[in-house]
């Protein structure tokens, strides 16, 4: 649906590339939702170029977003979140590409928090939990979660691991042992609304025992 | 011999920010977290955040999250702890303590603490 | 936030005899429990961690014990220099969290 539209105000008619991508995070700040669109080409002449949507709103017909740096924003209570709106990239009054979009499908949620991993004595094995604001909200509570974890020393030998919940075991017996591993995870959801990954928790890093000290902590200096 | 050594106590008047220091020495600086730990007069302990001194990762208690800011200086093995906007809650005793080799979730070895008094 | 509570703020007990302190996680923590001891004037020091494992050079008569929700915390045979506050903390999730503490008093 990202459109091309001949800019009438340039003499020589060029084709400019006005396609952009939106997401939308529902109950943001409080019951507050907040709509994001960027364009797709970081080239384009931002200057006299804004953002409205139109249509599945409460109370308004239209709303004009907010110019931050390379970013248009709005944030809001006023999305029915029912039906789709209509995004368009304006001149004044004139659109130049528009884009028809239901914000439940382009929902991007909030960064997973307090990732940390622990590692249980006797157990043999790394028990990892994190923390997601979408626990609490009433709209996008359900989401799949992406655990990815590598040696340190493994630049881009990432293992994924999907899950729904905010907890998973990593058995000892399958990491190297004596090892640096570094720990992120993200989300996306998963029931009911669609859209994008999260970005992605800062990082956590841990270290594995030495295959003989299943137990007892061991200072290894 | 692991040590923990934090700078003196500070009065500050409310309002004002404070910056203490916990040096350390004995083990590889960069192999460990390091936490920051209050405790208020007569009171339990709260955990306030960690850095990871190998790449200044951090995380936070909510609670502490636009109140404290932790930093390290990898070249002196120190890592610091800003506290803004201090009111009389803030005045409390601050350790610094060293998080478990593994996963740095639990603390085998402490500072002798800094005293944050926030007086007028 | 796991809560973790202790019941008893205060205990008393004589040199020789044997006392428990307990505390409860206010949700399952597994076996990530770790005590420390403060006495008067000085820092927290690490006696026990994972729920059981007593840290190097902590005397045996301090042990611990406990899973999911329930942890005990036992000084076998007490000693003048036992006194002291006894913290318990959990260290499966953040925030880190610890029990409001029990004093242990000698008779």
């Known amino acids: 649906e990202s459109g091309y539209a001949q800019n009438g105000d340039l003499e020589d008619a060029e084709l400019d590339d006005y396609s952009f991508s939106c997401y939308s995070q529902l109950e943001v700040n409080g019951s507050q939702h907040s709509l994001t669109c960027a364009f797709e080409d970081p080239d384009v002449n931002i200057t006299n170029l804004e953002f409205e949507i139109c249509g599945a709103l409460v109370e308004v017909k239209c709303l004009n977003f907010r110019k931050l740096q390379e970013i248009y924003f709005i944030e809001t209570k006023k999305f029915l979140l029912i039906g789709k709106s209509n995004i368009c990239v304006k001149v004044g009054e004139k659109s130049l590409t528009c884009k028809k979009i239901d914000l439940t499908t382009i929902v991007k949620p909030e960064a997973p928090f307090d990732l940390s991993v622990v590692y249980r004595e006797g157990a043999n094995d790394f028990v990892v939990t994190f923390n997601t604001s979408h626990l609490q909200k009433k709209y996008v509570k359900v989401l799949m979660h992406d655990v990815a974890y590598r040696q340190e020393k493994d630049e881009n030998k990432w293992t994924h691991v999907n899950l729904s919940s905010t907890k998973l075991t990593l058995l000892q017996r399958k990491l190297q042992p004596a090892a640096m591993y570094e720990i992120k995870v993200r989300s996306i959801p998963d029931h009911y609304f669609k859209g994008f990954w999260s970005e992605w928790s800062p990082s956590y890093y841990f270290r594995t025992p030495e295959i003989n000290n299943s137990s007892g902590e061991m200072d290894p200096i | 011999e692991v040590q923990l050594q934090q700078s003196g106590p500070e009065l500050v008047k409310p309002g004002a920010s404070v910056k203490m220091s916990c040096k350390a020495s004995?083990?590889?600086?960069?192999?460990?977290?390091m936490h920051w730990v209050k405790q208020s007069h007569g009171k339990s302990l709260e955990w306030i955040g960690y850095?990871?001194?190998?790449?200044?990762?951090?995380g936070y208690n909510q609670k502490f999250k636009g109140k404290a800011t932790l930093t390290v200086d990898k070249s002196s093995s120190t890592v610091y702890m800003e506290l803004r906007s201090l009111t009389s809650e803030d005045s409390a005793l601050y350790y610094c303590?060293?998080?478990?080799?593994?996963?740095?979730?639990?603390?085998?070895?402490w500072g002798q603490g800094t005293t944050l008094t926030v007086s007028s | 936030d796991i809560v973790m509570t202790q019941s008893h703020k205060f205990m008393s007990t004589l040199v020789g005899d044997r006392v428990s302190i307990t505390c409860k996680a206010s949700?399952?923590?597994?076996?990530?429990v770790a005590w420390y001891q403060q006495k008067p004037g000085q820092s927290p020091k690490l006696l026990i961690y994972?729920?059981?494992y007593r840290y190097t050079g902590v005397p045996d008569r301090f042990t611990g014990s406990g899973s999911g929700t329930d942890f005990t915390f036992t000084i076998s045979s007490v000693q003048a220099e036992d006194l002291a506050v006894y913290y318990c903390?959990?260290?499966?999730?953040?925030?880190?969290?610890f029990g409001g503490g029990t004093k242990l008093e000698i008779k």
């Open positions: 303590a060293r998080g478990t080799y593994y996963d740095g979730s639990y603390f085998d070895y």
């Open positions: 004995g083990y590889t600086f960069s192999d460990y977290y």
């Open positions: 850095i990871y001194p190998d790449n200044g990762g951090n």
């Open positions: 949700q399952d923590v597994s076996t990530t």
């Open positions: 994972s729920a059981s």
């Open positions: 903390q959990q260290h499966y999730s953040i925030p880190r969290t």
